[in-house]
């Protein structure tokens, strides 16, 4: 008996061939021996089976002795043995229809679990193997689970169902809902305007939800909500904002926040959370602000940084076009009795400058100027 595998929702064509290459009488029946379809001369006739509306044949092939049974919009319950009767012969075809679906939704939050469930006909014992967009293979039976989804899991999952040495392939598009970056650091000189951007790693037709930015300033003992906002069909509207600092928010995606000026008291870490409508859980992005200040007080030139810096970052003070006078893995450096000239304060990581602030030291009889 020939075995054919089908996919739920698809169309399958079961073949039946006569030795005579001409149109002769044929019938397709199900395992209950109830007629599905057949011919009466050149006319297609249909029986009362449940396939009545979804069954068809190709009249154009009848003259060649081919009498296919086409079943559209396959259902699991269409799994059956189909019998083609032609020229006093019976050809049997066993059709097994499978369905593969993702748990509840194909749009999942980063960190959530993906469960793929295989629908299969009674009596079948299929095996399933799925390959994620990043090439990870998972195997299972009726259900397959992947915990802690990552951004790289977004894309087309290819799953192969194996039964009776035959295979059928399913493709499922999974969208992992996340921000493009889990964390970002903004380096600014004191007084500069700060731009925070929170681009999403996915696009959907309609995006609705609400969000909030909590901020933990380095100098503060507790965190504080800086802004809350709503998102309706990709339009952003601010609900509540603190007076200090008075953040501004863009009205369109990507989510965009502006801090009028970087001040040491604002340096620290923030956590932007976004709760999406009809989703349990929230999207998170961490944002860090590092602020630099260079000052000269009497005979002391000081450079300081505030905010979350890594211990390997180097803070240096140097006179322009000269070697660094002082370089330390600390958050403050100073030079006593600095020479007149343009001094540079540099925050660098393995030689790469992250932040730079210039201060002009005048001869001792005049006041310093900050360009």
């Amino acid at each position: 008996k020939k075995v054919v595998l089908g996919k739920k929702g698809d169309t399958v064509e079961l073949t039946c061939t006569a030795s005579q290459k001409k149109s002769i009488q044929f019938h397709w029946k199900n395992s209950n021996q109830i007629k599905i379809l057949g011919n009466q001369g050149s006319f297609l006739t249909k029986g009362p089976s449940k396939l009545n509306d979804r069954a068809d044949s190709r009249r154009s092939l009848w003259d060649q002795g081919n009498f296919p049974l086409i079943i559209k919009n396959l259902k699991i319950e269409d799994s059956d043995t189909y019998i083609c009767e032609v020229e006093d012969q019976k050809e049997e075809v066993q059709l097994l229809v499978f369905g593969l679906t993702a748990n509840s939704d194909t749009h999942l939050l980063q960190g959530q679990s993906l469960t793929l469930t295989l629908e299969s006909p009674p009596g079948s014992s299929p095996s399933v193997q799925c390959r994620s967009p990043r090439g990870k293979n998972i195997q299972g039976g009726k259900t397959l689970s992947v915990s802690q989804l990552e951004l790289q899991d977004s894309g087309t999952w290819t799953c192969t169902v194996l039964q009776n040495q035959k295979k059928v392939e399913f493709k499922i598009d999974i969208v992992v809902l996340a921000f493009q970056k889990a964390s970002s650091i903004v380096y600014k000189k004191e007084g500069e305007q700060v731009e925070f951007s929170f681009p999403l790693a996915f696009t959907v037709e309609k995006l609705t939800g609400s969000g909030e930015l909590w901020w933990q300033a380095e100098r503060a003992s507790s965190s504080k909500s800086w802004i809350t906002f709503d998102l309706k069909n990709k339009e952003v509207s601010v609900k509540r904002v603190t007076q200090d600092p008075k953040l501004q928010m863009g009205k369109k995606l990507p989510l965009h926040l502006t801090l009028p000026q970087a001040l040491p008291q604002y340096a620290g870490s923030g956590n932007l959370t976004l709760a999406l409508e009809a989703k349990t859980g929230k999207l998170h992005q961490e944002v860090n602000l590092v602020v630099m200040r260079a000052t000269q007080l009497q005979k002391n030139l000081t450079c300081e940084v505030w905010g979350p810096t890594s211990p390997k970052l180097m803070l240096s003070l140097k006179l322009e076009n000269k070697e660094a006078k002082v370089s330390k893995r600390e958050k403050a450096v100073w030079v006593l009795n600095p020479e007149a000239g343009m001094w540079q304060c540099l925050l660098s990581d393995s030689g790469q400058v992250l932040l730079e602030s210039n201060i002009k030291v005048l001869p001792t009889w005049s006041t310093p100027v900050q360009p």
Epitope: N32, I34, K35, K46, G47, P48, S49
Partner: antibody, heavy 120, light 107 residues
Framework: QVQLQESGPGLVKPSETLSLTCTVS????????WSWIRQSAGKGLEWIGR???????NYNPSLKSRVTMSVDTSKNQFSLKLNSVSAADTAVYYC??????????????WGQGTTVTVSS | DVQMTQSPSSLSASVGGRVTITCQAS??????LNWYQQKPGKAPKLLIY???NLETGVPSRFSGSGSGTDFTFTISSLQPEDFATYYC?????????FGGGTKVEIK
Amino acid sequence: QVQLQESGPGLVKPSETLSLTCTVSGGSISTYYWSWIRQSAGKGLEWIGRIYTSERPNYNPSLKSRVTMSVDTSKNQFSLKLNSVSAADTAVYYCARELERPYYYGMDVWGQGTTVTVSS
Amino acid sequence: DVQMTQSPSSLSASVGGRVTITCQASQDISNYLNWYQQKPGKAPKLLIYYASNLETGVPSRFSGSGSGTDFTFTISSLQPEDFATYYCQQYDNLPLTFGGGTKVEIK
């Protein structure tokens, strides 16, 4: 066991719409085809059509332009609407369950029938 | 549609007698034929399916035969409860169609 009960007006005016409902008790409506058959003195038994929850209804071509069938799984009911009626539609209307089993397809459970008269 | 022609339309018979009803299809319907019995004021009841298979619980005095276009229904020894109208019905094609019926009356 499964029982069927037809309900609806016994008298319908010509050109109006005949509406009947069949309530299924003692079983789920979701796993079978359900049909309407009518019996008039002039035409004997006439199959009107059948409906299954997940398929398009099948109607008798002779009535197709006037008939609509629907299923309400939440109420375990299915219904028949026949519009533009005339005296020729006067009949006893039966609802029935259609069953497929090896070598057999037919109506195995019937309602008791409801008489509909078309008259002004 | 498949037309089903039943004959006779009525007949009179005696208790213990033999009754034969014929049904002719307008085209080949293989063995896809049911026979129903209907009593006044009641819904039809299945007696024979697939031309010759006796439905469970139906007395063996009822039988059916034939295939293709010509079918026969027989009651070998008529009982008082058998006086009713009998219908053939094809299920080879949709729409399902019935014969015009044969009324069996007491002689």
